[in-house]
Amino acid sequence: LIIGFGISGRHSITVTTVASAGNIGEDGILSCTFEPDIKLSDIVIQWLKEGVLGLVHEFKEGKDELSEQDEMFRGRTAVFADQVIVGNASLRLKNVQLTDAGTYKCYIITSKGKGNANLEYKTGAFSMPEVNVDYNASSETLRCEAPRWFPQPTVVWASQVDQGANFSEVSNTSFELNSENVTMKVVSVLYNVTINNTYSCMIENDIAKATGDIKVTESEIKRRSHLQLLNSKAS
């Protein structure tokens, strides 16, 4: 969480941002809140980015002002116009690109004063892994697949029964470049699996950590997966 205060001139207002990550090709949110004003027409929201000459987005007098928007963000940004009055200056960024990563500034002007806060935005690709029993293999084998990751993650296997065991000798991980030539499909195979055990396939890069669990018994197979972003710090 980053909390920024106003600069010279009028009174300062508090602006708060939260560092976040964007998934390439999907929509992302750059979070920013501020002390609200009673009149929408008095609120100016500006998003700026380090390394970019023009504005990322500008909202003033109750509407988007696009004439100074930098070409790299054209048609890809929007604020939540109906929530500006309650102090939400968050920016929706459509079709996140790798190059969208960097330092952003949320800059607010209201009748109460001015304020700004920086936000670190990471971009990459992350997806839920799915773990399945590989019935085609000669021995009991598990296959963990996740369709989109970037940068290249690490893959670690763990088991409930053999806690602390190192499975690197009995697993094989491959990374296959996807058609857009940025993200990769992650496939990891674990051999010599025993029944009545829960195995976890953990995929992690500097943006996200995802886990796919599978419990194999004689009567059933149970699966569970979850994904966690690693860098949500407020500012």
Partner: antibody, heavy 116, light 113 residues
Framework: QVQLVQSGAEVKKPGSSVKVSCKAS????????ITWVRQAPGQGLEWIGG????????KYAQKFQGRVTITADESTSTAYMELSSLRSEDTAVYYC?????????WGQGTLVTVSS | DIVMTQSPDSLAVSLGERATINCKSS????????????LAWYQQKPGQPPKLLIY???TRESGVPDRFSGSGSGTDFTLTISSLQAEDVAVYYC?????????FGQGTKVEIK
């Protein structure tokens, strides 16, 4: 109201450098880029480059790359354009302007004369 | 880079008559994302900086008389002065702000016939 006040006219020798200043007032200086445009006598308008004052990010026209440096001082709301290795063809009025795209506000211009 | 070409280079028109200036861009300045043309027109009088007249190809800047109008889309644009006044004598420039480097037309000088 928005105002951009530029430094006075300069006479320079070929091979030397010139630094033109542009003091902004009437708006939030850190919010908008400052653009520099020049106009040779009797000629059209030529984009030199611009700067995002809050991050110091500068972009230059390829023609001036390596010869021009645009900077900004947030504390004084002033932008600067320095052009080095001056030649006679650099004789022109140099304008600063608010914004990096649509230019609604211009400085009054600074005449730079390059003569031996 | 986008190149802007204006025609004619100069134009002599009688007071009260219509003046038309054309501007052509080497590639489209129409953005598909917002359907706006990133084109502006400026007026410059001797010894003064340019003054913004029209933006988004056809939106008049506040305070600009309604005898000035802009039209066109994509690559072809026109500035029209419907009834030329003595104070309209100036050089007029079109400018694209679709992408950097910003580019201006070479200018069209408007005089009274």
């Amino acid at each position: 109201q928005v105002q951009l006040v530029q430094s006075g006219a300069e006479v320079k020798k070929p091979g030397s450098s010139v630094k033109v200043s542009c003091k902004a007032s009437g708006y939030s200086f850190i919010s908008y880029a400052i653009t520099w445009v020049r106009q040779a006598p009797g000629q059209g308008l030529e984009w030199i480059g611009g700067i995002n004052p809050i991050f110091g990010t500068a972009k230059y026209a390829q023609k001036f790359q390596g010869r021009v440096t645009i900077t900004a001082d947030e504390s004084t709301s002033t932008a600067y354009m320095e052009l080095s290795s001056l030649r006679s063809e650099d004789t022109a009025v140099y304008y600063c302007a608010k914004g990096q795209a649509l230019i609604q506000h211009w400085g009054q211009g600074t005449l730079v004369t390059v003569s031996s | 880079d986008i190149v802007m070409t204006q025609s004619p280079d100069s134009l002599a028109v009688s007071l009260g008559e219509r003046a038309t200036i054309n501007c052509k861009s080497s590639q489209s300045v129409l953005s598909s994302s917002n359907n706006k043309n990133y084109l502006a027109w400026y007026q410059q009088k001797p010894g003064q900086p340019p003054k913004l007249l029209i933006y988004w190809a056809s939106t008049r800047e506040s305070g600009v008389p309604d005898r000035f109008s802009g039209s066109g889309s994509g690559t072809d644009f026109t500035l029209t002065i419907s009834s030329l006044q003595a104070e309209d004598v100036a050089v007029y420039y079109c400018q694209q702000y679709y992408s950097t480097p910003l580019a201006f037309g070479q200018g069209t000088k408007v005089e009274i016939k």
